[in-house]
Amino acid sequence: ESGYAQNGDLEDAELDDYSFSCYSQLEVNGSQHSLTCAFEDPDVNTTNLEFEICGALVEVRCLNFRKLQEIYLIETKKFLLIGNSNICVKAGEKSLTCKNVNVATIVKPEAPFDLSVIYREGANDFLVTFNTSHLQKKYVKVLMHDVAYRHEKDENNWMHVNLSSTKLTLLQRKLQPKATYEIKVRSIPGDYFKGFWSEWSPSYYFRTPEINNHSGETNPT
């Protein structure tokens, strides 16, 4: 468990950029947590390089990561989930670079799923619902969600709605009639835990009905 590399310690290693980033996922496999780290530079020669986390662990000093192709992974129950750990890139016993990381503040939730959109004719709106595995979790239960939708012809013109529940109503009059829309959702920790946006859910596509010119009402298509 060595500390930060001192200047002059690294010889040729100093020429390389070993900067890395990590994210945690809590209760991702039952009660097990995961911590995933990867080098920022995909071209780093990772032969003989290892990752190690020390501190803020339950009844152990340090844990070693498993190497899985381009990522380094730990699956464990041994995170205290408070305070800083020291994550180091190591070549043998030598630490090439280290950073202080609080596992509870680099949480990346699991992506939402089962996204669907139901048109409600009487209400002239669309009910958007989705699910998240975090409703069943002990820790990262409080999430903020970002629902993004766009007209399929508007390549980059995404509309965003932030919400804390898993239901959203889109008013029909705010959407173009007789058009196809793409919608997707992602989540970020709220409350005690902090971190990053999840991956996007798979997109869902829905069509808006045409407007009935006589009554001002619309017909779903």
Partner: antibody, heavy 119, light 105 residues
């Protein structure tokens, strides 16, 4: 101001259990670990264990594992240390200490609770 | 488990003198902390993360070191500095050294 106030002195018989409380004030109780450190008469300091008040996760010194139990009540910002199967060499001053999670040092200490184990 | 050995066990000095206290670890550690304890009182933090002064600690206290060897220095002893000093390492099981008593010569 930040303060840890511990319960009063205890006298126990060998084989009994003791439960010491530590009431925190002046800070967010769930934001820092609570540690327990003991000091036998004329001796040095010995870390016993810690609890994360937010989730109740504990980490114990192997020397005390199975005999010490750390708990907390977040509604009253109080941590507890229970030591069972007491022996005469458990006679000591028991301190609670707030853990600074950035550097893992104990930045605020309780006043100490004297536990005497004697038949 | 890492063992921290403090030396000397007792340091006899006069007010105004410089005190140098050592803490040696059985293996390399990342951070070392120092505490002061007076009779009948709880320990109080002096130095954290090797060299940072804890809140309210005067600048005559300083810390240094890396790897396995760490030092607490009191540049000029004041009467209130005569006490026992403990080093402690940052990681599980948060081991303390045996202490160095700084006494009046």
């Amino acid at each position: 101001q930040v303060q840890l106030v511990q319960s009063g002195a205890e006298v126990k018989k060998p084989g009994a259990s003791v439960k010491v409380s530590c009431k925190a004030s002046g800070y967010t109780f769930t934001g820092y670990t609570m540690n327990w450190v003991r000091q036998a008469p004329g001796q040095g300091l010995e870390w016993m264990g810690l609890i994360n008040p937010y989730n109740g996760v504990t980490s114990y010194n192997q020397k005390f594992k199975g005999r010490v139990t750390l708990t907390r009540d977040t509604s009253i910002s109080t941590a507890y240390m229970e030591l069972s199967r007491l022996r005469s060499d458990d006679t000591a001053v028991y301190y609670c200490a707030r853990g600074d999670g950035n550097y893992w040092y104990f930045d605020v200490w309780g006043q100490g609770t004297t536990v005497t184990v004697s038949s | 488990e890492i063992v921290l050995t403090q030396s000397p066990a007792t340091l006899s000095l006069s007010p105004g003198e410089r005190a140098t206290l050592s803490c040696s670890a059985s293996s390399s550690v990342t951070y070392m902390h120092w505490y002061q304890q007076k009779p009948g009182q709880a320990p109080r933090p002096l130095i954290y993360e090797i060299s940072k002064l804890a809140s309210g600690i005067p600048a005559r206290f300083s810390g240094s070191g890396s790897g396995t060897d760490f030092t607490l220095t009191i540049s000029s002893l004041e009467p209130e500095d005569f006490a026992v000093y403990y080093c402690q390492e940052w990681n599980y099981p948060y081991t303390f050294g045996g202490g160095t008593k700084v006494e009046i010569k």
